[in-house]
Protein backbone atom coordinates (compact mmCIF):
# COMPACT_ATOMS: atom_id res chain seq x y z
CA UNK A 1 0.00 0.00 0.00
CA UNK A 2 1.55 3.33 -1.01
CA UNK A 3 2.02 5.96 1.71
CA UNK A 4 -1.11 7.89 2.55
CA UNK A 5 -3.37 5.01 1.52
CA UNK A 6 -3.28 2.83 4.62
CA UNK A 7 -6.30 2.38 6.88
CA UNK A 8 -4.86 4.67 9.58
CA UNK A 9 -4.97 7.61 7.18
CA UNK A 10 -8.51 6.76 6.07
CA UNK A 11 -9.64 6.58 9.70
CA UNK A 12 -8.24 10.01 10.49
CA UNK A 13 -9.86 12.53 8.10
CA UNK A 14 -9.11 15.41 10.49
CA UNK A 15 -5.35 14.93 10.05
CA UNK A 16 -3.47 17.79 8.38
CA UNK A 17 -2.67 17.03 4.73
CA UNK A 18 0.98 16.13 4.22
CA UNK A 19 3.30 18.87 3.02
CA UNK A 20 5.34 18.23 -0.14
CA UNK A 21 8.45 17.49 1.98
CA UNK A 22 6.56 15.10 4.28
CA UNK A 23 5.08 13.29 1.29
CA UNK A 24 8.53 12.84 -0.26
CA UNK A 25 9.98 11.67 3.09
CA UNK A 26 7.16 9.15 3.53
CA UNK A 27 7.50 7.95 -0.06
CA UNK A 28 11.24 7.29 0.33
CA UNK A 29 10.71 5.41 3.58
CA UNK A 30 7.98 3.34 1.95
CA UNK A 31 10.39 2.38 -0.86
CA UNK A 32 13.11 1.60 1.70
CA UNK A 33 10.74 -0.77 3.49
CA UNK A 34 10.12 -2.49 0.14
CA UNK A 35 13.84 -2.78 -0.51
CA UNK A 36 14.30 -4.28 2.97
CA UNK A 37 11.75 -7.00 2.16
CA UNK A 38 13.48 -7.74 -1.16
CA UNK A 39 16.91 -7.83 0.48
CA UNK A 40 15.55 -10.24 3.05
CA UNK A 41 14.52 -12.69 0.33
CA UNK A 42 17.84 -12.25 -1.50
CA UNK A 43 19.91 -12.78 1.63
CA UNK A 44 17.89 -15.80 2.74
CA UNK A 45 18.14 -17.40 -0.70
CA UNK A 46 21.90 -17.00 -1.23
CA UNK A 47 25.00 -15.98 0.67
CA UNK A 48 25.46 -12.85 -1.47
CA UNK A 49 25.00 -10.53 1.48
CA UNK A 50 28.11 -11.96 3.11
CA UNK A 51 30.13 -12.23 -0.11
CA UNK A 52 33.53 -10.62 -0.48
CA UNK A 53 33.40 -11.03 -4.28
CA UNK A 54 31.12 -7.97 -4.66
CA UNK A 55 33.90 -5.88 -6.17
CA UNK A 56 34.22 -8.24 -9.14
CA UNK A 57 30.60 -7.78 -10.15
CA UNK A 58 30.48 -4.12 -9.16
CA UNK A 59 33.01 -3.26 -11.87
CA UNK A 60 30.48 -4.30 -14.53
CA UNK A 61 27.68 -2.18 -13.08
CA UNK A 62 27.47 1.57 -13.31
CA UNK A 63 25.09 2.08 -10.40
CA UNK A 64 24.36 5.69 -9.37
CA UNK A 65 26.28 6.68 -6.25
CA UNK A 66 26.44 9.84 -4.17
CA UNK A 67 29.78 11.62 -4.05
CA UNK A 68 31.01 14.72 -2.23
CA UNK A 69 30.73 16.83 -5.42
CA UNK A 70 26.98 16.12 -5.65
CA UNK A 71 26.27 18.47 -2.76
CA UNK A 72 24.16 15.98 -0.79
CA UNK A 73 26.58 15.31 2.07
CA UNK A 74 26.81 17.42 5.20
CA UNK A 75 30.10 18.90 4.02
CA UNK A 76 29.62 20.99 0.90
CA UNK A 77 25.83 20.70 1.06
CA UNK A 78 24.15 22.41 -1.92
CA UNK A 79 20.37 22.13 -2.20
CA UNK A 80 20.00 22.70 -5.95
CA UNK A 81 22.96 20.55 -7.04
CA UNK A 82 21.85 17.79 -4.69
CA UNK A 83 18.24 17.76 -5.91
CA UNK A 84 19.44 17.43 -9.52
CA UNK A 85 21.69 14.51 -8.47
CA UNK A 86 18.84 12.75 -6.63
CA UNK A 87 16.45 13.00 -9.60
CA UNK A 88 19.13 12.06 -12.16
CA UNK A 89 20.20 9.11 -9.99
CA UNK A 90 16.64 7.84 -9.59
CA UNK A 91 16.09 8.06 -13.36
CA UNK A 92 19.30 6.05 -13.86
CA UNK A 93 18.13 3.44 -11.33
CA UNK A 94 14.91 2.80 -13.28
CA UNK A 95 16.53 0.36 -15.72
CA UNK A 96 17.98 -1.61 -12.79
CA UNK A 97 14.57 -1.69 -11.08
CA UNK A 98 13.15 -3.06 -14.32
CA UNK A 99 15.81 -5.80 -14.22
CA UNK A 100 14.66 -6.75 -10.70
CA UNK A 101 11.11 -7.46 -11.84
CA UNK A 102 11.63 -11.14 -12.66
CA UNK A 103 14.18 -11.80 -9.95
CA UNK A 104 11.85 -12.58 -7.02
CA UNK A 105 9.54 -15.48 -6.23
CA UNK A 106 7.72 -14.68 -2.98
CA UNK A 107 8.25 -10.90 -3.24
CA UNK A 108 7.16 -10.32 -6.83
CA UNK A 109 4.51 -7.75 -5.85
CA UNK A 110 6.99 -5.99 -3.57
CA UNK A 111 9.43 -5.61 -6.47
CA UNK A 112 6.68 -4.07 -8.60
CA UNK A 113 5.68 -1.75 -5.74
CA UNK A 114 9.28 -0.51 -5.38
CA UNK A 115 9.42 0.21 -9.11
CA UNK A 116 6.07 2.05 -9.25
CA UNK A 117 6.72 3.99 -6.03
CA UNK A 118 10.05 5.16 -7.42
CA UNK A 119 8.27 6.57 -10.50
CA UNK A 120 5.91 8.47 -8.17
CA UNK A 121 8.86 9.73 -6.12
CA UNK A 122 10.55 11.07 -9.26
CA UNK A 123 7.36 13.00 -10.08
CA UNK A 124 7.23 14.47 -6.55
CA UNK A 125 10.86 15.56 -6.79
CA UNK A 126 10.51 17.03 -10.29
CA UNK A 127 7.76 19.30 -8.92
CA UNK A 128 10.16 20.42 -6.20
CA UNK A 129 13.08 21.08 -8.59
CA UNK A 130 13.61 24.55 -10.04
CA UNK A 131 16.34 23.60 -12.49
CA UNK A 132 14.75 20.81 -14.55
CA UNK A 133 17.01 21.60 -17.54
CA UNK A 134 20.03 20.27 -15.61
CA UNK A 135 18.42 16.83 -15.30
CA UNK A 136 19.60 14.38 -17.96
CA UNK A 137 17.29 11.51 -18.86
CA UNK A 138 18.97 8.18 -19.69
CA UNK A 139 18.89 7.09 -23.33
CA UNK A 140 16.19 4.39 -23.86
CA UNK A 141 18.30 2.49 -26.42
CA UNK A 142 21.28 2.32 -24.05
CA UNK A 143 18.96 1.14 -21.27
CA UNK A 144 17.45 -1.58 -23.47
CA UNK A 145 20.85 -3.01 -24.38
CA UNK A 146 21.99 -2.82 -20.74
CA UNK A 147 18.90 -4.77 -19.69
CA UNK A 148 19.57 -7.45 -22.31
CA UNK A 149 23.19 -7.71 -21.16
CA UNK A 150 22.23 -8.07 -17.48
CA UNK A 151 19.62 -10.72 -18.24
CA UNK A 152 22.16 -12.73 -20.25
CA UNK A 153 24.52 -13.15 -17.25
CA UNK A 154 25.00 -16.52 -15.57
CA UNK A 155 22.99 -17.36 -12.42
CA UNK A 156 25.72 -16.40 -9.94
CA UNK A 157 26.25 -12.99 -11.58
CA UNK A 158 22.49 -12.39 -11.74
CA UNK A 159 22.19 -13.09 -8.00
CA UNK A 160 25.14 -10.81 -7.29
CA UNK A 161 23.70 -8.09 -9.55
CA UNK A 162 20.36 -8.28 -7.72
CA UNK A 163 22.12 -7.94 -4.35
CA UNK A 164 24.25 -5.02 -5.53
CA UNK A 165 21.30 -3.14 -7.06
CA UNK A 166 19.30 -3.44 -3.85
CA UNK A 167 22.24 -2.45 -1.66
CA UNK A 168 23.16 0.53 -3.85
CA UNK A 169 19.57 1.69 -4.23
CA UNK A 170 19.07 1.51 -0.46
CA UNK A 171 22.25 3.50 0.12
CA UNK A 172 21.32 6.07 -2.53
CA UNK A 173 17.83 6.54 -1.08
CA UNK A 174 19.13 6.87 2.46
CA UNK A 175 21.66 9.51 1.37
CA UNK A 176 18.81 11.25 -0.49
CA UNK A 177 16.56 11.09 2.56
CA UNK A 178 19.20 12.64 4.82
CA UNK A 179 19.85 15.40 2.28
CA UNK A 180 16.18 16.17 1.63
CA UNK A 181 15.64 16.56 5.36
CA UNK A 182 18.13 19.45 5.29
CA UNK A 183 16.22 21.26 2.53
Amino acid sequence: VPPGEDSKDVAAPHRQPLTSSERIDKQIRYILDGISALRKETCNKSNMCESSKEALAENNLNLPKMAEKDGCFQSGFNEETCLVKIITGLLEFEVYLEYLQNRFESSEEQARAVQMSTKVLIQFLQKKAKNLDAITTPDPTTNASLLTKLQAQNQWLQDMTTHLILRSFKEFLQSSLRALRQM
Epitope: E22, D25, R29, R39, C49, E50, S75, K170, R178
Partner: antibody
Amino acid sequence: QVQLVESGGGLVQPGGSLRLSCAASGFTFSNYYMTWVRQAPGKGLEWVSSIYSFSGDTAYADSVKGRFTISRDNAKNTLYLQMNSLKSEDTAVYYCTRNLGGVVVTTNGYDYWGQGTQVTVSS
Amino acid sequence: DVVMTQSPSSLPTSLGDSVTITCQASQSISDELSWYQQKPGQTPKLLIYGASKLQTGVPSRFSGSGSGTSFTLTISGLEAEDLATYYCLQGYSWPFMFGQGTKVELK
Protein backbone atom coordinates in the same frame (compact mmCIF):
# COMPACT_ATOMS: atom_id res chain seq x y z
CA GLN B 1 28.37 -12.32 19.09
CA VAL B 2 28.62 -8.62 18.26
CA GLN B 3 31.63 -6.90 19.80
CA LEU B 4 32.92 -3.34 19.57
CA VAL B 5 36.28 -2.62 21.18
CA GLU B 6 37.60 0.95 21.32
CA SER B 7 41.26 1.88 21.75
CA GLY B 8 43.55 4.87 21.33
CA GLY B 9 42.31 7.04 24.19
CA GLY B 10 44.67 8.71 26.66
CA LEU B 11 45.96 11.98 28.05
CA VAL B 12 46.80 14.71 25.55
CA GLN B 13 47.61 18.41 25.81
CA PRO B 14 45.25 21.07 24.40
CA GLY B 15 45.93 21.49 20.68
CA GLY B 16 47.17 17.91 20.41
CA SER B 17 45.84 14.98 18.39
CA LEU B 18 44.59 11.45 19.02
CA ARG B 19 43.28 8.69 16.79
CA LEU B 20 40.63 6.42 18.23
CA SER B 21 39.97 2.98 16.75
CA CYS B 22 37.03 0.64 17.13
CA ALA B 23 37.50 -3.01 16.18
CA ALA B 24 34.21 -4.64 15.23
CA SER B 25 33.44 -8.35 15.13
CA GLY B 26 30.46 -10.71 15.05
CA PHE B 27 28.59 -8.98 12.20
CA THR B 28 29.03 -7.86 8.59
CA PHE B 29 30.65 -4.53 9.41
CA SER B 30 30.33 -3.03 5.91
CA ASN B 31 26.52 -3.27 6.03
CA TYR B 32 26.14 -0.97 9.02
CA TYR B 33 26.25 2.73 9.77
CA MET B 34 28.64 3.44 12.62
CA THR B 35 28.66 6.32 15.07
CA TRP B 36 30.85 7.86 17.77
CA VAL B 37 29.07 9.11 20.90
CA ARG B 38 30.84 10.75 23.83
CA GLN B 39 30.08 11.46 27.47
CA ALA B 40 31.92 14.11 29.48
CA PRO B 41 32.45 13.34 33.21
CA GLY B 42 29.11 13.59 35.04
CA LYS B 43 27.34 14.82 31.89
CA GLY B 44 24.89 13.44 29.34
CA LEU B 45 25.44 11.70 26.02
CA GLU B 46 26.58 13.71 23.00
CA TRP B 47 26.39 12.49 19.40
CA VAL B 48 29.76 13.18 17.77
CA SER B 49 29.88 11.75 14.26
CA SER B 50 28.39 9.11 11.95
CA ILE B 51 29.68 7.37 8.85
CA TYR B 52 27.41 5.58 6.45
CA SER B 53 27.98 2.18 4.88
CA PHE B 54 29.15 2.48 1.31
CA SER B 55 28.55 6.08 0.24
CA GLY B 56 31.38 7.67 2.21
CA ASP B 57 28.79 10.08 3.59
CA THR B 58 29.78 11.45 7.00
CA ALA B 59 28.18 13.82 9.49
CA TYR B 60 29.55 15.72 12.49
CA ALA B 61 28.31 17.60 15.53
CA ASP B 62 28.89 21.37 15.28
CA SER B 63 31.23 21.18 18.29
CA VAL B 64 33.74 18.95 16.43
CA LYS B 65 33.25 19.91 12.77
CA GLY B 66 36.54 20.77 11.09
CA ARG B 67 38.60 19.19 13.88
CA PHE B 68 37.48 15.56 13.91
CA THR B 69 37.41 13.11 11.00
CA ILE B 70 35.49 9.83 11.03
CA SER B 71 36.54 7.03 8.69
CA ARG B 72 36.20 3.29 8.30
CA ASP B 73 38.16 0.41 6.83
CA ASN B 74 35.61 -2.24 5.84
CA ALA B 75 38.37 -4.72 4.99
CA LYS B 76 39.73 -4.45 8.54
CA ASN B 77 36.30 -4.14 10.23
CA THR B 78 37.53 -0.99 11.94
CA LEU B 79 36.05 2.43 12.64
CA TYR B 80 38.31 5.44 13.31
CA LEU B 81 38.03 8.91 14.79
CA GLN B 82 40.92 11.26 14.08
CA MET B 83 40.79 14.08 16.63
CA ASN B 84 42.89 17.20 15.99
CA SER B 85 43.14 20.59 17.76
CA LEU B 86 41.81 18.99 20.92
CA LYS B 87 40.24 21.21 23.59
CA SER B 88 39.60 20.61 27.28
CA GLU B 89 35.87 20.31 26.51
CA ASP B 90 36.64 17.22 24.39
CA THR B 91 37.49 15.35 27.61
CA ALA B 92 35.06 12.43 27.71
CA VAL B 93 34.54 8.72 27.34
CA TYR B 94 34.16 7.99 23.62
CA TYR B 95 31.82 5.17 22.63
CA CYS B 96 31.76 3.38 19.30
CA THR B 97 28.21 2.35 18.37
CA ARG B 98 26.50 0.34 15.66
CA ASN B 99 23.37 1.69 14.04
CA LEU B 100 20.33 -0.58 13.91
CA GLY B 101 19.81 -2.00 10.49
CA GLY B 102 22.03 -3.79 8.13
CA VAL B 103 19.63 -5.67 5.92
CA VAL B 104 16.25 -4.76 7.38
CA VAL B 105 15.63 -1.79 9.68
CA THR B 106 16.17 1.72 8.36
CA THR B 107 15.29 3.70 11.49
CA ASN B 108 18.04 5.33 13.55
CA GLY B 109 19.01 3.79 16.86
CA TYR B 110 22.26 2.43 18.31
CA ASP B 111 21.85 -1.22 19.27
CA TYR B 112 25.44 -2.11 20.25
CA TRP B 113 27.93 0.00 22.19
CA GLY B 114 31.59 -0.55 22.97
CA GLN B 115 32.85 -0.16 26.55
CA GLY B 116 34.29 3.24 25.69
CA THR B 117 37.78 4.76 25.72
CA GLN B 118 38.73 7.69 27.95
CA VAL B 119 40.13 10.83 26.33
CA THR B 120 41.53 13.47 28.68
CA VAL B 121 42.66 16.84 27.33
CA SER B 122 44.67 18.70 29.93
CA SER B 123 47.89 20.64 30.29
CA ASP C 1 19.39 22.29 14.00
CA VAL C 2 16.72 20.19 15.71
CA VAL C 3 16.91 20.83 19.47
CA MET C 4 15.65 18.14 21.86
CA THR C 5 14.16 19.19 25.17
CA GLN C 6 13.80 16.33 27.64
CA SER C 7 11.82 16.60 30.86
CA PRO C 8 11.94 16.26 33.75
CA SER C 9 15.68 16.25 34.43
CA SER C 10 15.10 14.33 37.66
CA LEU C 11 12.19 12.06 38.54
CA PRO C 12 11.85 10.95 42.20
CA THR C 13 9.53 7.94 42.20
CA SER C 14 8.54 4.77 44.03
CA LEU C 15 8.83 1.16 42.95
CA GLY C 16 5.66 0.01 41.21
CA ASP C 17 4.83 3.51 39.96
CA SER C 18 4.13 4.29 36.34
CA VAL C 19 6.81 6.66 35.05
CA THR C 20 6.53 9.04 32.10
CA ILE C 21 9.42 10.92 30.46
CA THR C 22 8.88 13.33 27.58
CA CYS C 23 11.02 14.62 24.76
CA GLN C 24 10.07 17.62 22.68
CA ALA C 25 11.67 18.37 19.30
CA SER C 26 11.99 21.94 18.04
CA GLN C 27 10.63 20.79 14.64
CA SER C 28 9.00 17.65 13.25
CA ILE C 29 11.29 14.60 13.27
CA SER C 30 8.65 12.12 12.03
CA ASP C 31 9.23 8.97 14.14
CA GLU C 32 13.04 9.11 14.05
CA LEU C 33 13.46 8.98 17.83
CA SER C 34 15.10 6.38 20.04
CA TRP C 35 15.32 5.97 23.84
CA TYR C 36 18.31 4.75 25.87
CA GLN C 37 18.84 3.63 29.44
CA GLN C 38 22.16 4.15 31.22
CA LYS C 39 22.95 2.81 34.66
CA PRO C 40 25.91 4.25 36.64
CA GLY C 41 29.23 2.89 35.36
CA GLN C 42 27.57 1.09 32.45
CA THR C 43 27.23 1.70 28.73
CA PRO C 44 23.89 2.96 27.38
CA LYS C 45 21.32 0.42 26.23
CA LEU C 46 18.80 0.87 23.40
CA LEU C 47 15.20 0.50 24.63
CA ILE C 48 12.98 1.94 21.89
CA TYR C 49 13.61 2.88 18.26
CA GLY C 50 11.32 4.40 15.64
CA ALA C 51 9.52 6.20 18.52
CA SER C 52 7.50 3.13 19.53
CA LYS C 53 9.30 -0.09 18.52
CA LEU C 54 10.57 -2.15 21.43
CA GLN C 55 14.15 -3.36 20.99
CA THR C 56 14.61 -7.14 21.25
CA GLY C 57 15.12 -8.30 24.84
CA VAL C 58 13.70 -5.16 26.45
CA PRO C 59 10.92 -5.83 29.00
CA SER C 60 7.39 -5.01 27.82
CA ARG C 61 6.86 -2.59 30.71
CA PHE C 62 8.79 -0.09 28.58
CA SER C 63 6.83 1.62 25.83
CA GLY C 64 7.32 4.60 23.55
CA SER C 65 4.83 6.80 21.78
CA GLY C 66 4.63 10.01 19.78
CA SER C 67 5.37 11.35 16.33
CA GLY C 68 6.32 14.72 14.90
CA THR C 69 7.51 16.89 17.79
CA SER C 70 6.25 15.22 20.97
CA PHE C 71 7.46 11.88 22.33
CA THR C 72 6.97 9.87 25.51
CA LEU C 73 8.74 6.98 27.22
CA THR C 74 6.59 5.14 29.76
CA ILE C 75 7.68 2.56 32.32
CA SER C 76 4.58 0.75 33.61
CA GLY C 77 5.36 -0.55 37.07
CA LEU C 78 8.85 0.63 37.92
CA GLU C 79 11.27 -2.07 39.12
CA ALA C 80 14.49 -1.56 41.07
CA GLU C 81 16.58 -2.43 38.00
CA ASP C 82 14.94 0.47 36.12
CA LEU C 83 16.59 3.11 38.31
CA ALA C 84 18.85 4.80 35.78
CA THR C 85 19.23 7.83 33.52
CA TYR C 86 17.18 7.86 30.31
CA TYR C 87 18.01 9.71 27.10
CA CYS C 88 16.13 10.36 23.89
CA LEU C 89 17.93 10.81 20.54
CA GLN C 90 16.66 12.42 17.36
CA GLY C 91 18.02 10.68 14.28
CA TYR C 92 16.07 12.68 11.73
CA SER C 93 18.50 15.29 10.47
CA TRP C 94 22.08 16.43 11.06
CA PRO C 95 23.36 17.10 13.60
CA PHE C 96 21.70 14.30 15.55
CA MET C 97 21.06 15.24 19.15
CA PHE C 98 20.40 13.57 22.51
CA GLY C 99 18.06 15.00 25.10
CA GLN C 100 19.64 16.22 28.35
CA GLY C 101 18.68 13.05 30.23
CA THR C 102 16.21 12.14 32.97
CA LYS C 103 17.46 10.54 36.17
CA VAL C 104 14.86 8.15 37.62
CA GLU C 105 15.55 7.71 41.32
CA LEU C 106 13.73 6.71 44.50
CA LYS C 107 11.94 9.37 46.55
